[in-house]
Amino acid sequence: QDPWAAEPRSACGPSSCYALFPRRRTFLEAWRACRELGGDLATPRTPEEAQRVDNLVGAGPASRLLWIGLQRQARQCQLQRPLRGFTWTTGDQDTAFTNWAQPATGGPCPAQRCVALEASGEHRWLEGSCTLAVDGYLCQFGFEGACPALQDEAGQAGPAVYTTPFHLVSTEFEWLPFGSVAAVQCQAGRGASLLCVKQPEGGVGWSRAGPLCLGAGCSPDNGGCEHECVEEVDGHVSCRCTEGFRLAADGRSCEDPCAQAPCEQQCEPGGPQGYSCHCRLGFRPAEDDPHRCVDTDECQIAGVCQQMCVNYVGGFECYCSEGHELEADGISCSPAGAMGARASQDLGDELLDDGEDEEDEDEAWEAFGGGWTEMPGILWMEPTQPPDFALAYRPSFPEDREPQIPYPEPTWPPPLSAPRVPYHSSVLSVTRPVVVSATRPTLPSAHQPPVIPATHPALSRDHQIPVIAANYPDLPSAYQPGILSVSHPAQPPAHQPPMISTRYPELFPAHQSPMFPDTQVAGTQTTTHLPAIPPNRAPLVTTLGAHQPPQAPDAPVLRTQATQLPIIPTAQPSLTTSSRSPVSPAHQVSVPAATQPPALPTLLPSQSPTNQTSPISPTHPHSKVPQIPREDGPSPKLALWLPSAAPTAAPTALGEASLAEHIQRDDRWL
């Protein structure tokens, strides 16, 4: 049977579905159709996603074309880039996969273009007129979780029929997105309907445990139960698990509740949720989320140090003022020579000393996230003169409530009087926090902007603004990009450095199509007032623990600080893009750094850097900085772009007033 004559069909994984709609539509109509169903046009950015699309599309006719979510405005070609100046309908240009039918050829790109995928052969990407009604379109739907397809039961009259939230009905799904309905018909008559729902203990699962059809009780095959089978009075059987295990979503098998590592530090089976979380010494459960552990700030305990105290993740250290040295108890100070000393009170039994190997030192270093605490009566630095360097840190004072995130240098005591301005390298390592000086710690910032939490709709993993993983080859720090968030090995996440954050403007309802010539929607553009760029500021680096959870259930992990970031000269590693060419089905193309979009193209117009504003284009669910398709409209505007899935190269001129490399956003775009 010709699938093209049939109903829409889809293929789902644990976190997203692709759906093929064999309906003739223009690009704009297809985009709207996907949006109305709660999705977006397909954005196959990786070879794995492309494989799922390939499997879904199958071997169609050569004459058939399907829209995917790539669009380019007139005169926006960037032929040296993997996407050639095209932008995903989710608002970014990041990709680890391309499948262009032809090599890029020079030209002025005079017209808006959209991308369609060939239904036959290699499913190559072709560009063409966005107003052409092609044969169909591919939508992508992200969701919070998925339920596995139900196992067939002995008493079933036929396979379960599933209906997804985006209205596709099939018996063929392997995974069912959250919100799907399963209809099971039983041979004995009555059937059952199940809903893929959020479970109280987290995750998603079917609303009812099996078996669903009345059978012969527990006798055959233990009723399908992994552990214990119980025959209920109504003839149903229900499954139970032995102590320390809980019933899985399928209602039959049993799982270790700690297997999915629901706790940040220590997990024990038992308790109302099937497990309970515990924190290591030096940590306590977070008030808002008992799964998470936060550092206990021992420096807040009166008398923990005689003079000065610095708290860090999992412990604290005492310091003495100039002319005093720390006694053996690590707390008291006694008169001594000119150099101070410090003792480590690492409650996690990870005491550092100079004899430890560099790797351990790095790990402890990455875990550090504390704040200086001055013990009463000792004023050791004048608050009115913050040092003039990028991460301009200073100690905390009673009247100061700004976040403090110093990174003390690991082997030297802190400065005991106002320090000189230290040398600050403009190249930052991707693998560890910024250590500004070889001899001094950095000090808490006098100009730290407040953290603005990101407000977001519930997004799928595919569509969240992700933490940019530091998945670079091992490079000397001079070759690492500077403006990046960094994923770290597992470590307690307490006292994180300031998160980068941007508040998104109001979202469009799914059925609106703002910013079209015929559709004027008021109040959709938000202006963010950005603070002035202080001189000689280096980039902020967000270090995130691997287990750092989002601050709110729907908030993405990465936050972008609402401040202008200067551009730093760095030698960039290349981003590898998997590309299928007409010659070979798939091969890796290493794209030079110069071809990559900027990491954080925070725009620096050629004007005074004070009171700058940056229009942020409206967003929608399942998107980064989405754009609305539009056939025609005004000239491009500059806008603040957020980084997205893959690490991308930063622009290279420090403090440039006008950057040719910056991508110009066009409010006609999706």
Epitope: D2, W4, A5, R24, T26, P61, A62, S63, R64, L65, W100, A101, Q102, P103, T105, P110, A111, Q112, R113, A116, E118, S120, L126, E127, G128, S129, C130, T131, L132, A133, V134, E631, D632
Partner: antibody
Framework: QVQLVQSGPEVKKPGASVKMSCKAS????????IHWVRQGPGQRLEWMGY????????TYNQKFKGRVTMTLDKSASTAYMQLNSLRSEDTAVYYC?????????????????WGQGTLVTVSS | DIQLTQSPNFLSASVGDRVTITCRAS??????VAWYQQKPGKAPKLLIY???NRYTGVPSRFSGSGSGTDFTLTISSLQPEDFATYYC??????????FGQGTKLEIK
């Protein structure tokens, strides 16, 4: 090379039917849609409809609906167009044309190859 | 239906001249426009597709431009074999193709 060869001229009386053929060669017949276009004397070109050899899908111009039928003989790589209830204003040259799929990495629905045309004269 | 109007209907020019033919659509057709050349007793030949892309084998003196509702076919330096009738075609509401009325290019 790609070729579309059409059947010879026809003279018909009003009310009669005409069936013409278009034989394709030089490409995979089922990969490309065949359109029919006509041109009356001194007139502009007028689209009549298409047939997709992949799945026999047809779409006709409303103006000809009920009078036109497009069919295929896939084994002979041939498309047919029949027009019924002929009138004098149906006197025209009838072309079959192949719709392109893509050229040099672009998708496009323009007509890249045309038959030489079949002249149909409707006269009493 | 989308209407296409070409201008001029007739054009007299000499070999070596630069000539421009315009085509106006009654509504936005994006770039789904093609240009064809037709000589007497012959079938049309594709010159330009997608408004501005030259078809394989078409001489570089032929160029197309425009998007939305206004389109142009330009012949930069007329050759003797270029004297013919030129048609624009839109296919934005595919499969409903419509053609312009044609522009006859004659030798002056």
């Amino acid at each position: 090379q790609v070729q579309l060869v059409q059947s010879g001229p026809e003279v018909k009386k009003p009310g009669a039917s005409v069936k013409m053929s278009c034989k394709a060669s030089g490409y995979t017949f089922t990969d490309y849609v065949i359109h029919w276009v006509r041109q009356g004397p001194g007139q502009r070109l007028e689209w009549m409809g298409y047939i997709n050899p992949y799945d026999d899908d047809t779409t006709y111009n409303q103006k000809f609906k009920g009078r036109v039928t497009m069919t295929l003989d896939k084994s002979a790589s041939t498309a047919y167009m029949q027009l019924n209830s002929l009138r004098s204003e149906d006197t025209a040259v009838y072309y079959c044309a192949r719709r392109g799929n893509s050229y040099d990495g672009y998708f496009d629905y323009s007509m890249d190859y045309w038959g030489q045309g079949t002249l149909v004269t409707v006269s009493s | 239906d989308i209407q296409l109007t070409q201008s001029p209907n007739f054009l007299s020019a000499s070999v070596g001249d630069r000539v421009t033919i315009t085509c106006r659509a009654s509504q936005n057709v994006g770039t789904a426009v093609a240009w064809y050349q037709q000589k007497p007793g012959k079938a049309p030949k594709l010159l330009i597709y997608s408004a501005s892309n030259r078809y394989t084998g078409v001489p570089s003196r032929f160029s197309g431009s425009g998007s939305g509702t206004d389109f142009t076919l330009t012949i930069s330096s007329l050759q003797p074999e270029d004297f013919a009738t030129y048609y624009c075609q839109q296919y934005t509401n595919y499969p409903m193709y419509t053609f312009g009325q044609g522009t006859k290019l004659e030798i002056k």
